[in-house]
Amino acid sequence: LGTLPAFLPCELKPHGLVDCNWLFLKSVPRFSAAASCSNITRLSLISNRIHHLHNSDFVHLSNLRQLNLKWNCPPTGLSPLHFSCHMTIEPRTFLAMRTLEELNLSYNGITTVPRLPSSLVNLSLSHTNILVLDANSLAGLYSLRVLFMDGNCYYKNPCTGAVKVTPGALLGLSNLTHLSLKYNNLTKVPRQLPPSLEYLLVSYNLIVKLGPEDLANLTSLRVLDVGGNCRRCDHAPNPCIECGQKSLHLHPETFHHLSHLEGLVLKDSSLHTLNSSWFQGLVNLSVLDLSENFLYESITHTNAFQNLTRLRKLNLSFNYRKKVSFARLHLASSFKNLVSLQELNMNGIFFRLLNKYTLRWLADLPKLHTLHLQMNFINQAQLSIFGTFRALRFVDLSDNRISGPSTLSEATPEEADDAEQEELLSADPHPAPLSTPASKNFMDRCKNFKFTMDLSRNNLVTIKPEMFVNLSRLQCLSLSHNSIAQAVNGSQFLPLTNLQVLDLSHNKLDLYHWKSFSELPQLQALDLSYNSQPFSMKGIGHNFSFVTHLSMLQSLSLAHNDIHTRVSSHLNSNSVRFLDFSGNGMGRMWDEGGLYLHFFQGLSGLLKLDLSQNNLHILRPQNLDNLPKSLKLLSLRDNYLSFFNWTSLSFLPNLEVLDLAGNQLKALTNGTLPNGTLLQKLDVSSNSIVSVVPAFFALAVELKEVNLSHNILKTVDRSWFGPIVMNLTVLDVRSNPLHCACGAAFVDLLLEVQTKVPGLANGVKCGSPGQLQGRSIFAQDLRLCLDEVLSWD
């Protein structure tokens, strides 16, 4: 007999982790004698229903180092149905684990800190009902380095007053380096905290005043977060208590003794001005978050940044004036002193003109590589200014209102009227997600490029070369989600001689000219997905001959354009390696006699082709035969294929990955995978497969991954695979209605390859007989039972 998975109903994962998450357990499982509990160092019991912990629950896990009990008995306000739940923990429950280093009790209805072993290093008590920490709460935890106790008194987990940390309660924790007490209604920073603290997070409390005595003796602090204590509620995505005063009150010497401070968060504090004395002596400050304040005026004349020569990241986002967008904005000259600045976030300050005076003091900063200018209502942008920046690698101008090259005459700062404002009566401070997953993935390839600009989600209708003057250094450009309705003809991007990646998805581009994009000699990746409008104009033809002339192009997306008729009959390119043609009408095109039979054949070096969502109802052998022979990956996912001629895979001698998920295959019949195929991965999940012909997989000797999940299989048979079953690294059979008869052969097979079967312990379930439906195939040992025990359906 094969051995049952040792930690049923849980799953053994790498590095000594037993995963018992989401199993509806009401008690801590007792593992079988065969389970080698001494090797288990991590146990995760997240999101179960364990409401009572006993002294004996963990005695068999003597070497446990990490225990996660999060979300078992959530407090009323955090419970999805607002059930009240009180977790009981017997006094010696955790003391049995003498090696325990990490314990997470978050999201449980506990009111006191249980007794804990002295070995503990990391403790999380967040989103519980613990409202008091005194000297006894954590007595003896001399190894404790990290304590999280967030969210024990706030709108989602309300309490009558506030969390109370008595003075000196944590003083005995001489190794404590991280303390987080966010969302606890604290009105003061607890006094007499251990001087070992390096990270102190007390954001989103009610601490509206901060002075040096609040942080006395905390000379080791490296990160201090006091944000959200005096909020500007007009920018709050959640219930917000208006601050009882006009801003957070900071004593001029609050931080003077914190010479090791590297990160300071003062976000959402209703600050209107910056006092340079706050930052005096912060010689190591490298990250400063001043977002969501009222610093729109202050940043134009402050000298507070004068001495922050080590600052690497500065966040000034959403420092807008309520209901106003400014005509223009000029940063203060003290910005030029930020000689170590690498990243500046100026999203959501709301100004309409971006010209050479806006950011003039940033241009010479030797390390500034990232600049965020999203959501500013910019409608006039002189993009050429970025050509003079010394180190710039990424400028994000997405979600603005740029409609073309800047046409305004250049007002000097002296002439500029900074008070000129425009009322914003319905500015949405919470814009939609910034990019669709597809375009995000496309732009990910720009991470290591020298210079990227994001102009997505603006109001561009036409592209003019003047927009890009002085930007020849640009290697990656996103123009997605605009309204560009142009017939591109090779003159639009002339200055961009080094451009390698261009994202034009979600526009209305008219592709007709053979010279389209020919002005971009270095272009390697081009995204033209979601430009369907021109293709849906009945009677208008489109031409893809431009692809031939892009000699460096490797990646092309024409996805989701509803391309189905009146386009070039061939795509030709020696360079293209990846073509995304998903979301089009190849089904219709291949039905037009032989017109589009050779559509992809001219892509002589193509390695990956995505034909998912192409309304394919039938795939003829000649369709596969006329795909490039170089092809290694073919995706036919989410079509309507009910039949597949498996022997025709021999037409694709280099194919390694075939994705047929989400089709309508009823069976894996019609021959077998052909001899000599190099196929390594086959995904036929989410079909309607009822049966598989014997030896179907047997000849595919390179096969490593097979996904048969979400089908209608009643068994998994060794005969389908032959000896290659032992070569598999993944055999996914989840979500099939397996017939759990006594002596069911699939049990032995799956046990034999159990390390290769995802979710074997719990995700592989019975579909019949009735009493086992929906239960794990190990709910009963099918190898040892008698047939009459299980009634047949």
Epitope: T166, K209, E213, Q245
Partner: antibody
Framework: QVHLQQSGPDLVKPGASVQMSCKTS????????LHWVRQRPGQGLEWIGW????????KYNDQFRGRTTLTADKSSSTAYMFLSSLTSEDSAIYFC?????????WGQGTTLTVSS | DIQMTQSPSSLSASLGGKVTITCKAS??????IAWYQHKPGKGPRLLIH???TLQPGIPSRFSGSGSGRDYSLSISNLEPEDIATYYC????????FGGGTKLEIK
């Protein structure tokens, strides 16, 4: 040395209003709270309220809210307390005091007499 | 609102002697208490803050102690200039003075 200089004594009629001042020196006026405290004859000290000159925020003791207004003039580093609808009950010595947490410096006091 | 009950309201002691004044808060004030000395015609003078921290320039004859709700001010080795009224002040939540203790020398 921090100094808080209060205006001189005042005699006013019931129903009238009064404004007293507290001129500060030798510290940054906008960085600290300025409080007002009352001492009636033969009685103890009562906190009236504070103003934070840095942003003009104010906080009042409930007993004094409505008839009391605290203001500050940054240019002269002077704080003011305005009391209206005076009655004989308002006869007292009024102190101003500087604080961050606790009151560390006090003015000498202004004596207000409300009498017809 | 936090109430501060100070006692005694007056006391008489001998030069060179020691006196203790107490203040009881209506709730835990986490050591946020200050003590003042007040002489007629002047503004009060800060002696102690955060329950036990002596203000610079104040003689060490003055000391403060306590925690939670109960706090005290002690003056040892009494001198003539110690004749004054003494007040406690809680600054944990807004501000409340105790009723005062008038110290006289026998």
């Amino acid at each position: 040395q921090v100094h808080l200089q209060q205006s001189g004594p005042d005699l006013v009629k019931p129903g009238a209003s009064v404004q007293m001042s507290c001129k500060t020196s030798d510290y940054t006026f906008t960085n600290y709270y300025l409080h007002w405290v009352r001492q009636r004859p033969g009685q103890g000290l009562e906190w009236i309220g504070w103003i934070y000159p840095g942003d003009g925020s104010t906080k009042y003791n409930d007993q004094f809210r409505g008839r009391t207004t605290l203001t500050a003039d940054k240019s002269s580093s002077t704080a003011y307390m305005f009391l209206s609808s005076l009655t004989s009950e308002d006869s007292a010595i009024y102190f101003c005091a500087k604080s961050w947490d606790y009151f560390d410096y006090w003015g000498q006091g202004t004596t207000l007499t409300v009498s017809s | 609102d936090i109430q501060m009950t100070q006692s005694p309201s007056s006391l008489s002691a001998s030069l060179g002697g020691k006196v203790t004044i107490t203040c009881k808060a209506s709730q835990d004030i986490d050591n946020y208490i200050a003590w003042y000395q007040h002489k007629p015609g002047k503004g009060p003078r800060l002696l102690i803050h955060y329950a036990s921290t002596l203000q610079p320039g104040i003689p060490s004859r003055f000391s403060g102690s306590g925690s939670g709700r109960d706090y005290s001010l002690s003056i040892s080795n009494l001198e003539p200039e110690d004749i004054a009224t003494y007040y406690c002040l809680q600054y944990d939540d807004l501000y409340t003075f105790g009723g005062g203790t008038k110290l006289e020398i026998k």
